[in-house]
C-alpha cells in the first residue's frame, strides 16, 4: 500500500492541562456513510474482486495502525512503539495527552495485503495542544456523571463555553458509533439508563484562509446513583474475638461496604489499643474486591509475622469512614486451649 | 538489478569494504537496503539494513553489531565495512532490496537480489 | 534481535506427497515472515510474503499460514522442481519493520 493515496484528515486535540483525558482517533474515511472503493492494478491470484469496498469504522473489525515519524524513519508499529496508545479494533486509544502524541497516523484494513494494492488507508495529522486560554474557567469536564432515573446532558468540553446558537455543528459518537441525530455542542438525556455510559466523542469544524481541521474532544460518561446517606458497614471481622495459636502468623481481613459517592475517598485502617496507648499499624495496601453500581466491597489485611503472648492483652480495630461517618470493629485475640 | 563487488581474500584480522551498486532504480524510493551472506553449504545469515529515507536508519544484526558499518554512499549504492574477520566470515556476501512498510509494501520483503562477492578469510 | 528457529533441518517425500516445515519466532512478528526458496548456485526467490500471500507467479502449492509466533510452509502435490532449500525470515524487530533473522533452513528432498 502507498501512504502517499491515502485519504489525508486533521484533527485538534486541545488538551487540558490540569484534567486527565483520554483521545481517540477512528479508522474512517471523511463521508463513512459512502462507499469507498480501493482500485487496484494488478491482482495476484489470491484477489478476485475487482474492487474491494472501503467500509467505514462500523463494518472494520481488524484494522493495522501505524505511525509515520516526522524525521523521516519508516512507519511503525504502534502496538511496540507507543505503549500510551491501545488499538480497539478500528479506534486508537490514546490514554494520556501531550504534545508529544501530535503526529501522522495510518490506518487500514488487514485483510488487504497484497504489494499491489493502491492506497486504501487514512492518514490522520494529528495536532496536540495544551489549552492556553483561561477565559472559559468552567468549561465541560472530560468525565461527565448522569443521575440514573433522571434527565441529564452531555457537554462537548470544546464547546461548552459557547451558547447553542453560535455553536457550530457537531458530529457525536458514542463507542464508536455515529449517533447521527445529535448535532448541537449538548446532548440531552431525557431520562438516564445504565446503557449511556460510555465514550463520547464530539467533533466540529474549524477553519482558516489556508485549511480547515476537525477539533475532537473525548467525554467518559459515567451513569451513576444519588449518593449514599449511609456510614459504610463493616462485613468481616463479624466477631469480636478470634482464637489464635500462640507463634503462629495471623492475617484478620476487614472488610467494609461503602455506598456510592461521586466524590469517593474511602478510608480503611487498622489501629492497635494497648493499655492507654493506640497506634496505627501500617498494613497492605486496601483493595477493592467488588464493585458494583451502588456500592464498593474494600478489603484491608492485618498481618502479625507470629503471634506473641503481648498480642492476646491488646484490641485489633478495624476503622472504616466515608463523607458521612464512620464505623469501627474492634476484635480481640484468645489463645486456642487444647 | 544489483551488482556487489569487493570480496577479497584476506587474512585474519584485516578489514575489508563490499560495495553494492544499484541499477535500473534508485534510493529516491523508500527501500531497506542490506546485506545478507551464506558460509559454504550453510544458511543465510542476516548482517544489517538501512534504510533509503532522509533517516538513512540502520538495523544489524546483533552479532554484526560493533564489527559491521552499513551505510549509504550515494543515490545507487551501499557499503559494508567488516573489520576484525576471522574465518568464520568466509562466505558469499549478498545485497538483497526489501519495500518499505507503507510505501508499496505490506511486509519488508526481499524482492531483489544481487549474485554476491565472495569473502574468503585464510592466513 | 528476533530468533526464528526452523523446523525440521531436513525431510524427504515423495513426488506428489506434502511436506510441512514448521518456524517459530522468540517473539510476537505479527504475521511479518516471508518464505524463500533456494536452489544451489541459485539467489533466493520469494514464495510467500505476509505469513500467507503468495508472490505472483508462485504456484498455489505453496501455503502459507500461522500467526503470532508460529508459522508455516505446507508443499503439496509435490513436483521434482521443489527440491531446494527453504528458509522463513522475519520483517518485524521492536516496532520496526524491517528485514532480519532468517530461519535455519529446511532441505526438502523430492523422491
Known amino acids: 500500500f502507498n501512504i502517499s493515496g491515502c485519504s489525508t484528515k486533521k484533527l485538534l486535540w486541545t488538551y487540558s492541562t490540569r484534567s486527565e483525558e483520554e483521545f481517540v482517533l477512528f479508522c474512517d474515511l471523511p463521508e463513512p456513510q459512502k462507499s469507498h472503493f480501493c482500485h487496484r492494478n494488478r491482482l495476484s491470484p489470491k484477489q478476485v474482486p475487482e474492487h474491494l469496498p472501503f467500509m467505514g469504522s462500523n463494518d472494520l473489525s481488524d484494522v493495522q495502525w501505524y505511525q509515520q515519524p516526522s524525521n523521516g524513519d519508516p512507519l511503525e508499529d504502534i502496538r511496540k512503539s507507543y505503549p500510551h496508545i491501545i488499538q480497539d479494533k478500528c479506534t486508537l486509544h490514546f490514554l494520556t495527552p501531550g504534545v508529544n502524541n501530535s503526529g501522522s497516523y495510518i490506518c487500514r484494513p488487514k485483510m488487504i495485503k497484497s504489494p499491489y494494492d493502491v492506497a486504501c488507508c487514512v492518514k490522520m495529522i494529528l495536532e496536540v495542544k495544551p489549552q492556553t486560554n483561561a477565559s472559559c474557567e468552567y468549561s465541560a469536564s472530560h468525565k461527565q456523571d448522569l443521575l440514573l432515573g433522571s434527565t441529564g446532558s452531555i457537554s462537548c468540553p470544546s464547546l461548552s463555553c459557547q451558547s447553542d446558537a453560535q455553536s457550530p455543528a457537531v458530529t457525536w459518537y458514542k463507542n464508536g458509533k455515529l449517533l447521527s441525530v445529535e448535532r448541537s455542542n449538548r446532548i440531552v438525556v431525557d431520562e438516564v439508563y445504565d446503557y449511556h455510559q460510555g465514550t463520547y466523542v464530539c467533533d466540529y469544524t474549524q477553519s482558516d484562509t489556508v485549511s480547515s481541521w476537525t477539533v475532537r474532544a473525548v467525554v467518559q460518561v459515567r451513569t451513576i446513583v444519588g449518593d449514599t446517606k449511609l456510614k459504610p458497614d463493616i462485613l468481616d471481622p463479624v466477631e469480636d474475638t478470634l482464637e489464635v495459636e500462640l507463634g503462629k502468623p495471623l492475617t484478620i481481613s476487614c472488610k467494609a461496604r461503602f455506598g456510592f459517592e461521586r466524590v469517593f475517598n474511602p478510608v480503611i485502617k487498622w489501629y492497635i489499643k494497648d493499655s492507654d496507648l493506640e497506634w496505627e499499624v501500617s498494613v497492605p495496601e486496601a483493595k477493592s474486591i467488588k464493585s458494583t453500581l451502588k456500592d464498593e466491597i474494600i478489603e484491608r489485611n492485618i498481618i502479625l509475622e507470629k503471634v506473641t503472648q503481648r498480642d492476646l492483652r491488646r484490641k485489633f480495630v478495624c476503622f472504616v469512614q466515608n463523607s458521612i461517618g464512620n464505623t469501627t470493629q474492634s476484635v480481640q485475640l484468645k489463645e486456642k486451649r487444647g | 538489478s544489483l551488482e556487489e563487488s569487493g570480496g577479497d581474500l584476506v587474512k585474519p584480522g584485516a578489514s575489508l569494504t563490499l560495495t553494492c551498486t544499484a541499477s535500473?532504480?534508485?534510493?529516491?524510493?523508500?527501500?531497506?537496503m542490506c546485506w545478507v551472506r551464506q558460509a559454504p553449504g550453510k544458511g543465510l545469515e542476516w548482517i544489517a539494513c538501512i534504510y533509503t529515507g532522509s533517516s538513512g536508519k540502520t538495523h544489524y544484526a546483533s552479532w554484526a553489531k560493533g564489527r559491521s558499518t552499513i551505510s549509504k554512499t550515494s543515490s545507487t549504492t551501499v557499503t559494508l565495512q567488516m573489520t576484525s574477520l576471522t574465518a568464520a566470515d568466509t562466505a558469499l556476501y549478498s545485497c538483497?532490496?526489501?519495500?518499505?512498510?507503507?510505501?508499496?509494501?505490506?511486509?519488508?520483503?526481499?524482492?531483489?537480489w544481487g549474485p554476491g562477492t565472495l569473502v574468503t578469510v585464510s592466513s | 534481535d528476533v530468533v526464528m528457529t526452523q523446523t525440521p533441518a531436513s525431510v524427504s517425500a515423495a513426488v506428489g506427497g506434502t511436506v510441512t516445515i514448521k518456524c517459530q519466532a522468540s517473539?510476537?512478528?505479527?504475521?511479518?515472515l516471508a518464505w524463500y526458496q533456494q536452489k544451489p548456485g541459485q539467489r533466493p526467490k520469494l514464495l510467500i510474503y505476509?505469513?500467507?500471500n503468495l508472490e505472483s507467479g508462485v504456484p498455489s502449492r505453496f501455503k502459507g499460514s500461522g500467526s503470532g509466533t508460529e508459522y508455516t510452509l505446507t508443499i503439496s502435490d509435490l513436483e521434482c522442481a521443489d527440491a531446494a532449500t527453504y528458509y522463513c525470515?522475519?520483517?518485524?524487530?521492536?516496532?520496526?519493520?524491517?528485514?532480519?533473522?532468517f530461519g535455519g533452513g529446511t532441505e526438502v528432498v523430492v523422491q
Open positions: 525470515q522475519c520483517s518485524y524487530d521492536g516496532g520496526s519493520y524491517v528485514p532480519n533473522a
Open positions: 505476509g505469513a500467507s
Open positions: 517473539q510476537n512478528i505479527y504475521d511479518n
Open positions: 535500473g532504480f534508485s534510493f529516491v524510493s523508500m527501500y531497506w
Open positions: 538483497a532490496r526489501a519495500g518499505s512498510v507503507g510505501y508499496g509494501y505490506d511486509t519488508a520483503y526481499f524482492n531483489l
